[in-house]
């Protein structure tokens, strides 16, 4: 921690003769600078220079040539690294008076004549004399106003709204300031600040728009911080809304945005008369061009049970806003289909969710479904295959006779999705076929029996079993089964010598 710099002359205040020269020296353990009174035009009579010395301290000299009333004021020496724009400068001070019989009051800028007060707060009417010995009177429309006076600051007190004039007499000559106007402004002890960005995602060439609104407060200073600030890319505006209550709407626009304009946009509001500060921030992203990302919540091969209700959800990120459509087997889904519907909802600024809904799945709903997402810059699609799962069922079970050879073929036609497996069983003791234990699975490796399977289409299969000779009456069972179910049928094969007779169980 550095000790405060020191000033020579080592005084709190000093009276300097008009048109004379004076110098102030500042000594510090680090680099030091001077803060001093300046008039509207930068004062050419002030010179600041660094001085070398053997003490190991840094020395900066402020020299005033031809001192005038405008040089009256507070001179502060401070360490370079300690000054911030917002805070009062911390350092060592000396107040200089330059009495001028023709200039009773220190010249002020026009904004100094505007005195803002909040409610019943005290305020300072900043008429400062160039001579500390000059008596000053404060006048309002109602006459003399009694308030405490300090020649370094002015009149301090609680003032009602209206114009005030400072009056002084120097060597018999009367001086009056132009009126100081006291205004009462509405200011709350807390800042009610709201930020709004209708969009946080843009593409190159668009205009970024961010607003910050301050409510019920007129004494506000608002600063914007944003990526293009150094280049002055932004255009700021302040809109006043007085009805039904006070609202100050600050708008920042950045036209012709580029990727470099991506980042944090921050508004910082500070109450001008109190150390109350509020900040709001939004992150803006600018893309070179529009984009689309598709994230399906299901795989590329999906199955649905017959009559089942199923939703297929696809999450989309896109900018600019996309058009979303669904195709089935490369044909646009007709929206008036009551049992297949699609909907789209916007879940966030650039996030969308599209749902394909099967209300009661049918066999013909099987196929290839495609979601197509497109905007002016991009197009993406995702295709999945849907299989409607149908339980196995046997369409037909018939036998063919091979004439005199005595051979017979049994054909079993079954359907289902997935395609059913066909299994054959045989019962040789015709009288006991009602008993499940009498049935045996037909093995593939029996020499006089041939089994084969032929898929007919996507959902139909034909199974065949050929008996080279049937010498006694037997029962044959066809069992068609898939994941969803199984069905069986039986028929009786009669040996040719017994004049075969077909029976379907």
């Amino acid at each position: 921690q550095l000790s405060l710099p020191s000033i020579l002359p080592n005084e709190n205040e000093k009276v300097v003769q008009l048109n004379s020269s004076f110098s102030l020296r500042c000594f510090g353990e680090s680099e030091v600078s001077w803060h001093y009174p300046t008039s509207e035009e930068e004062n050419p009579n002030v010179e600041i220079r660094n001085e070398e010395n053997n003490s190991g301290l840094f020395v900066t000299v402020l020299e005033v040539v031809n001192a005038s009333a405008a040089h009256t004021g507070l001179y502060t020496c401070y360490y370079n690294h300690t000054q911030t724009d917002e805070n009062e400068i911390e350092g060592r001070h000396i107040y200089i008076y330059v009495p001028d019989p023709d200039v009773a009051f220190v010249p002020l800028g026009m904004t100094d004549y505007l005195v803002i007060v909040e409610d019943d707060d005290s305020a300072i009417i900043p008429c400062r004399t160039t001579d500390p010995e000059t008596p000053v009177t404060l006048l309002s429309n109602d006459g003399v106003v009694h308030a405490s006076y300090d020649s370094r600051q002015g009149f301090n007190g609680t003032f009602s709204v209206g114009p005030y004039i400072c009056e002084a007499t120097v060597r018999g000559k009367k001086f009056q300031t132009i009126p100081f106007n006291v205004y009462a402004l509405k200011a709350t002890s807390e800042l009610d600040l709201e930020m709004e960005a209708l969009k946080t995602v843009y593409k190159s060439g668009e205009t970024i728009v961010v607003t910050c609104a301050v409510f019920n407060n007129e004494v506000v200073d608002l600063q914007w911080t944003y990526p293009g600030e150094v280049k002055g890319k932004g255009i700021t505006m302040l809109e006043e809304i007085k009805v039904p209550s006070i609202k100050l709407v600050y708008t920042l626009r950045v036209p012709e945005a580029t990727v470099k304009d991506s980042g944090d946009y921050e508004c910082a509001a500070r109450q001008a008369t109190k150390e109350v500060k509020e900040m709001k921030k939004v992150t803006i992203s600018v893309h070179e061009k529009g984009f689309i990302e598709i994230k399906p919540n299901f795989s590329q091969l999906e199955a649905v049970d017959l009559h089942e209700v199923k939703h297929f959800v696809v999450d989309v990120q896109a900018y600019p806003p996309p058009r979303i459509s669904w195709l089935k087997d490369n044909l646009t889904l007709i929206e008036n289909l009551t049992e297949i519907t699609t909907d789209i909802e916007r879940t966030q600024e650039i996030r969308y969710r599209s749902k394909l809904k099967l209300i009661r799945a049918k066999e013909e709903d099987s196929g290839h479904y495609t979601i197509v997402v497109q905007n002016e810059d991009d197009v993406k699609s995702y295709t999945f295959e849907l299989l409607t799962q149908v339980p196995s069922s046997i369409l037909d079970l018939v036998d063919d006779h091979h004439g005199s050879t005595g051979g017979q073929t049994v054909r079993c036609i079954a359907e289902g999705t997935p395609l059913p497996d066909i299994e054959w069983m045989i019962c040789k003791d015709i009288k006991k076929c009602n008993n499940e234990t009498s049935w045996a699975i037909l093995a593939n490796n029996i020499s006089n029996i041939i089994t084969e399977v032929h898929p007919r289409d996507r959902s139909t299969v034909e199974g065949r079993v050929t008996f080279t000779r049937v010498e006694e009456t037997i029962a044959v069972r066809c069992l068609a089964k898939n994941l969803l179910g199984a069905e069986s049928r039986e028929l009786k094969l009669v040996a040719p010598t017994l004049r075969s007779e077909l029976t379907v169980a």
Partner: antibody, heavy 127, light 107 residues
């Protein structure tokens, strides 16, 4: 041909209210293509923008004058007015009403440049 | 608040000469700067907007350049009617502000 014509007193007493009206002919103040505003020029402060409004009713004031300033609009007469309260000698200036071009960027209109001015009215604040 | 500083305060030139006027902003204003011309007893007239675009009806001898903080108005060959006061104005930072002016006078 667009014309702007100011009217109002040339002399105002300190602490009173300065009131000026600008009548627009040859164009509508309800156009979405323009803002309409007030400026002033004094030897001490040079050219200074006072405030503007947009046909939607939005008003924009110079922060240094905000507490004393009201800009109002009478669309039926195609006029807009300036009221500046509690005037002092520092408010002595030539006052101009002007048309301000706008830029449209897809998100709305925002102010541009002062492309048409009236001839100006000298207002003196003195007792 | 942005401050615009114009230089020089006065420029003394003869007709036919080239005039170069400067406007410097206290912080960057991109290209959001305009130039106005004002003759005695008249209102200002827009000459150049967005740093380099000539307003309607403005002769080609007037041109503007610059971006960020430093801007220039050039009058390639002064005509008698060009002797006037010229102001720059920014619309980047609220409130819109003008420079203090450069007077171009006859030498």
């Amino acid at each position: 041909q667009l014309q702007l014509q100011e009217s109002g007193p040339g002399l105002v007493k300190p602490s009173e209210t300065l009131s000026l009206t600008c009548t627009v002919s040859g164009g509508s103040i309800q156009s979405s293509s323009y803002y309409w505003g007030w400026l002033r020029q004094s030897p001490g402060k040079g050219l200074e923008w006072i405030g503007s409004f947009f046909y939607t009713g939005s008003t924009y004031y110079n922060p240094s004058l905000r507490s004393r300033l009201t800009i109002s609009v009478d669309t039926s007469k195609n006029q807009f007015s300036l009221m500046l309260s509690s005037v002092t000698a520092a408010d002595t200036a030539v006052y101009y009403c002007a048309r301000q071009s706008t830029y449209y960027d897809g998100s709305g209109n925002y102010y541009g440049w002062f492309d048409r001015w009236d001839q100006g009215t000298l207002v003196t604040v003195s007792s | 608040e942005i401050v615009l500083t114009q230089s020089p305060a006065t420029l003394s030139l003869s007709p036919g000469e080239r005039a170069t006027l400067s406007c410097r902003a206290s912080q960057a204003v991109s290209s959001y700067l305009a130039w106005y011309q004002q003759k005695p007893g008249q209102a200002p007239r827009l000459l150049i907007y967005d740093a380099s675009n000539r307003a309607t009806g403005i002769p080609a001898r007037f041109s503007g350049s610059g971006s960020g903080t430093d801007f220039t108005l050039t009058i390639s060959s002064l005509e008698p009617e060009d002797f006037a006061v010229y102001y720059c104005q920014q619309r980047s930072n609220w409130p819109p502000a003008f420079g203090q002016g450069t007077k171009v006078e006859i030498k």
